[in-house]
Interface confidence: low
């Protein structure tokens, strides 16, 4: 493992029909509450169980929503974006960016973590290695006493 992580970015048009509880997902982001460093885009933070988005199955937590019914979501306050979704009507067309993590072959969705964050294995591997070195040093030191 060389620690390198690549990202495969794909875009998709997703058409949702508003259900009894709305579109069935929560969003984060906006110019006043950036979810990703240097990116004021709108991201899906949670897919509600049995909601319209969950039943459709294509929208994923961590996806970036680029537009709603053709209206760009760039440079919007968070609440502006919320209002836009609330008033988008019954049939809603979303332009979505999926960011897939490609790590040594297998492709897995990033999920709900911070899309700009460090993948957890990059933290865990060095921590594990340090722990092993410390344990070995401790055992060796004990044997010398």
């Amino acid at each position: 493992m060389n620690g390198r992580v690549d990202y495969l970015v794909t875009e998709e048009e997703i058409n949702l029909t508003r259900g009894p509880s709305g579109l069935g997902f929560n969003i984060v982001g906006g110019t006043d509450q950036q979810y990703v460093s240097n990116d004021s885009g709108i991201y899906v933070s949670r897919i509600k169980e049995n909601g319209a988005a969950a039943l459709d199955g294509r929208l994923q937590e961590g996806d970036k929503i680029l537009s709603v019914n053709g209206q760009d979501l760039k440079n919007l306050l968070h609440q502006d974006a919320v209002d836009l979704f609330r008033n988008a009507g019954y049939a809603v067309s979303l332009r979505v960016q999926h960011r897939l993590q490609v790590q040594n072959g297998p492709i897995g969705h990033r999920g709900e973590g911070d899309p700009s964050g460090i993948p957890i294995f990059m933290v865990l591997v060095p921590v594990f290695a340090l722990t092993m070195v410390a344990a070995w040093a401790f055992m060796r030191y004990r044997q010398q006493l």
């Epitope: 760009d72 760039k74 919007l76 306050l77 609440q79 502006d80 209002d83 836009l84």
Partner: nanobody, 120 residues
Amino acid sequence: DVQLVESGGGLVQPGGSLRLSCTASGYPISTYAMGWVRQAPGKGPEWVATIYYSGVTHYRNSVKGRFTISRDNAKNTLHLQMNSLKPEDTAVYYCAKGVNGTYLRVEAEYRGQGTQVTVS
């Protein structure tokens, strides 16, 4: 003191057009969400259209494609171009200011006195 003054209402035949204007004083409209709400006789206030500080606009479904909201930052004026008017568009139209840059409020302190639009 914040003040909103609407103009441009009137009596028009079905299918006709009107252009409403709202002049704001006391703050720059470009830094807020601004919009229009309307109130028909005996009914509650109804949201019509919003323009955000970013320039993004959105409309209630029944007016989409017929109404266009815009603003003139230099003149600090908000406009609502209303085409293909229908009898159900009859109402008093109020210019409204967003609170914290977002939600439109219909309480007196957040809107103008209104301008009557009658489609008949």
